[in-house]
Interface confidence: low
């Protein structure tokens, strides 16, 4: 349905508040270094223009595309060249190349200061003084640090952020009320950002077909009673929503997501019995709730898959006539029967099935050739099951911090060229799989663990893509989306790596470590551990454990000392010497 003015159409659909918030997110995700005030000015200008188009859709420039309007506005920024360098060259291009150019310059790891949380009273005063600016600043700071954050979901986070301040700034103990809520929002926000980053990587690096396959598998697990035609419709609509958001079309994305939530709720009888509560909520909560809804119960007495996909004499005919629909049917039928499998495992099975049909349907006796295809699935299923069992046992034995350390050592040995901050961040997140998933019963462990690991390994892939340093990482990241985790699991110690020169400065610590939070102190120690492995990749677990135990004792001792700085200087030298001796450096 063509509209005379796209900007007027979206303004009317979304309302002024959401329109302004989404334009701010879009601009902050594109121009990540621009000051807050500059973005607010640009957003206000766009909003005023949109209002003139609502009043008269035939007014000048109202017929222009949103990319043209927004791109023109971004290109008015005076300091574009000095702040962004070659990104300024995007402005010499025409749409749609200009928008593609802006997208390519999005930075997953922008050089921005860490967000420091002010005192609660300071935050509450700022909230009460100017609530609108306070909330805009939240959107701006999150969006510029997470340039692929799912924009409609960020509106939901902002709503919760506002609710937390509204409630807690009038509580007796403001800090006790507010801080846990902010911690929860921060952790959920990081997880949400990483999950969306995988969706965008899937679309941008592997194409729409890959994303649709993922969506068929996930929605079939979630809505096993829904008919294939229904799942297909949801997949088509969901793909459109995520394609738009990943492409920077945030107004269209938010609008279409609202339409999808409306459709799901109007048709919940034919989709899932679990949607009732979600569908009673307001729009932002409703969309979030649907996205997180638990799997519906599987229909009873589902017949065997073999009849239609192995035993039928028409398998090759069906496959030849409509390959993707037939494979989609296979994936749908397999996934709805297996909520206990990870999505990536289901996709590996579908790929194996596809490869077998490609080979066998050209053979002299196709049925004889593909008759045992389901037997090929067994090792594919057992590999993640065994891996999860082993790692959950290790996690239960070590606890989260030491489990992270084991992964730090493992991954540093696999890909020692990767930067230390990236190895620490990724390994810490990999280690969180333990507390996140190992508590689940067997039937829920694999979908929890392996699909979470896919999200974390994608973080490694996008960070590495910015400054590629390891052929092994590039290979695992680019060859197959669904085989990334098995690819990294299969990597052994990199024998080609030349150990890093020893630098005493890397292992010099100061009294400031004593005032850090437990989490920050862990990161310092884990950074040292990665550096140790880079210096001595062949060090044994026992050697590394001994050095790390000495290091922990050293920090504890000096933090209790009267003259902390002197203790760190003197004891630090002894620790470095002892570590060098222990590791044979």
């Amino acid at each position: 349905d063509a509209h005379k003015s796209e900007v007027a159409h979206r303004f009317k659909d979304l309302g002024e508040e959401n329109f302004k918030a989404l334009v701010l997110i879009a601009f902050a995700q594109y121009l990540q270094q621009c000051p807050f005030e500059d973005h607010v000015k640009l957003v206000n200008e766009v909003t005023e223009f949109a209002k003139t188009c609502v009043a008269d859709e035939s007014a000048e420039n109202c017929d222009k595309s949103l990319h043209t309007l927004f791109g023109d506005k971004l290109c008015t920024v005076a300091t574009l060249r000095e702040t962004y360098g070659e990104m300024a060259d995007c402005c010499a291009k025409q749409e749609p190349e200009r928008n593609e150019c802006f997208l390519q310059h999005k930075d997953d790891n922008p050089n921005l200061p860490r967000l420091v949380r002010p005192e609660v009273d300071v935050m509450c005063t700022a909230f009460h003084d100017n609530e609108e600016t306070f909330l805009k600043k939240y959107l701006y700071e999150i969006a510029r640090r997470h340039p692929y954050f799912y924009a409609p979901e960020l509106l939901f986070f902002a709503k919760r952020y506002k609710a937390a301040f509204t409630e807690c700034c009038q509580a007796a103990d403001k800090a006790a009320c507010l801080l846990p809520k902010l911690d929860e929002l921060r952790d959920e926000g990081k997880a949400s950002s990483a999950k969306q980053r995988l969706k965008c990587a899937s679309l941008q690096k592997f194409g729409e077909r890959a994303f649709k396959a993922w969506a068929v598998a996930r929605l079939s697990q979630r809505f096993p009673k829904a008919e294939f035609a229904e799942v297909s419709k949801l997949v088509t609509d969901l793909t459109k929503v995520h394609t738009e958001c990943c492409h920077g079309d945030l107004l269209e994305c938010a609008d279409d997501r609202a339409d999808l939530a409306k459709y799901i709720c109007e048709n919940q009888d034919s989709i899932s019995s679990k949607l009732k509560e979600c569908c009673e909520k307001p729009l932002l909560e409703k969309s979030h709730c649907i996205a997180e809804v638990e799997n519906d119960e599987m229909p009873a007495d589902l017949p065997s898959l073999a009849a239609d996909f192995v035993e039928s004499k028409d398998v090759c005919k069906n496959y030849a006539e409509a390959k993707d629909v037939f494979l989609g049917m296979f994936l749908y039928e397999y996934a709805r029967r297996h909520p206990d499998y990870s999505v990536v495992l289901l996709l590996r099975l579908a790929k194996t099935y596809e490869t077998t049909l490609e080979k066998c349907c050209a053979a002299a006796d196709p049925h004889e050739c593909y008759a045992k295809v389901f037997d090929e699935f067994k090792p594919l299923v057992e590999e993640p099951q065994n891996l999860i069992k082993q790692n959950c046992e290790l996690f239960e034995q070590l606890g989260e911090y030491k489990f992270q350390n084991a992964l730090l050592v493992r991954y540093t040995k696999k890909v020692p060229q990767v930067s230390t901050p990236t190895l620490v961040e990724v390994s810490r997140n990999l280690g969180k799989v333990g507390s996140k998933c190992c508590k689940h019963p067997e039937a829920k462990r694999m979908p929890c663990a392996e699909d979470y690991l896919s999200v974390v390994l994608n973080q490694l892939c996008v960070l590495h893509e910015k400054t590629p340093v390891s052929d092994r990482v590039t290979k695992c990241c680019t060859e197959s989306l669904v085989n990334r985790r098995p690819c990294f699991s299969a990597l052994e110690v990199d024998e080609t790596y030349v150990p890093k020169e020893f630098n005493a400065e890397t292992f010099t610590f100061h009294a400031d470590i004593c005032t850090l939070s437990e989490k920050e102190r862990q990161i310092k120690k884990q950074t040292a551990l990665v550096e140790l492995v880079k210096h001595k990749p062949k060090a044994t677990k026992e050697q590394l454990k001994a050095v790390m135990d000495d290091f922990a004792a050293f920090v504890e001792k000096c933090c209790k000392a009267d003259d902390k700085e002197t203790c760190f200087a003197e004891e630090g030298k002894k620790l470095v010497a002892a570590s060098q001796a222990a590791l044979g450096l």
Epitope: E227, D269, F326
Partner: nanobody, 115 residues
Framework: QVQLQESGGGLVQPGGSLRLSCAAS????????MSWVRQAPGKGPEWVSA????????RYAESVKGRFTISRDNAKKTLYLQMNSLNPDDTAVYYC????????GSQGTQVTVSS
């Protein structure tokens, strides 16, 4: 867009007959097995009958065996259910579905058997 549109339902006396049709669009109809499913008031969906992509292999629920016949015309992209010797227990909304699904994805057609 995958779409299924049922028709042919109505009110019929016990012992009477009806022929249901299901027009398919948006996918290669001839490549898929199809099923008929029904849902009686206040009950869950019940699988009725299935047919393979070529029409050679048909299957029926015990409750309808010998009375119902499933067929298809791939050229017309249409699935049929011939229902004979209808009784009040056959009163339900009837849906056609792709493959082995037992849940509705379309509007269905109402069949009421009553004197």
């Amino acid at each position: 867009q995958v779409q299924l549109q049922e028709s042919g339902g109505g009110l019929v006396q016990p012992g009477g007959s009806l022929r249901l049709s299901c027009a398919a669009s948006g996918f290669t109809f001839g490549s898929f097995g199809m099923s008929w499913v029904r849902q009686a008031p206040g009950k869950g969906p019940e699988w009725v009958s299935a047919i393979d992509s070529s029409g050679a292999d048909t299957r029926y629920a015990e409750s309808v065996k010998g009375r119902f016949t499933i067929s298809r015309d791939n050229a017309k992209k249409t699935l049929y259910l011939q229902m004979n010797s209808l009784n009040p227990d056959d009163t339900a909304v009837y849906y056609c579905t792709i493959g082995q699904s037992i849940s509705r994805g379309s509007q269905g057609t109402q069949v009421t058997v009553s004197s």
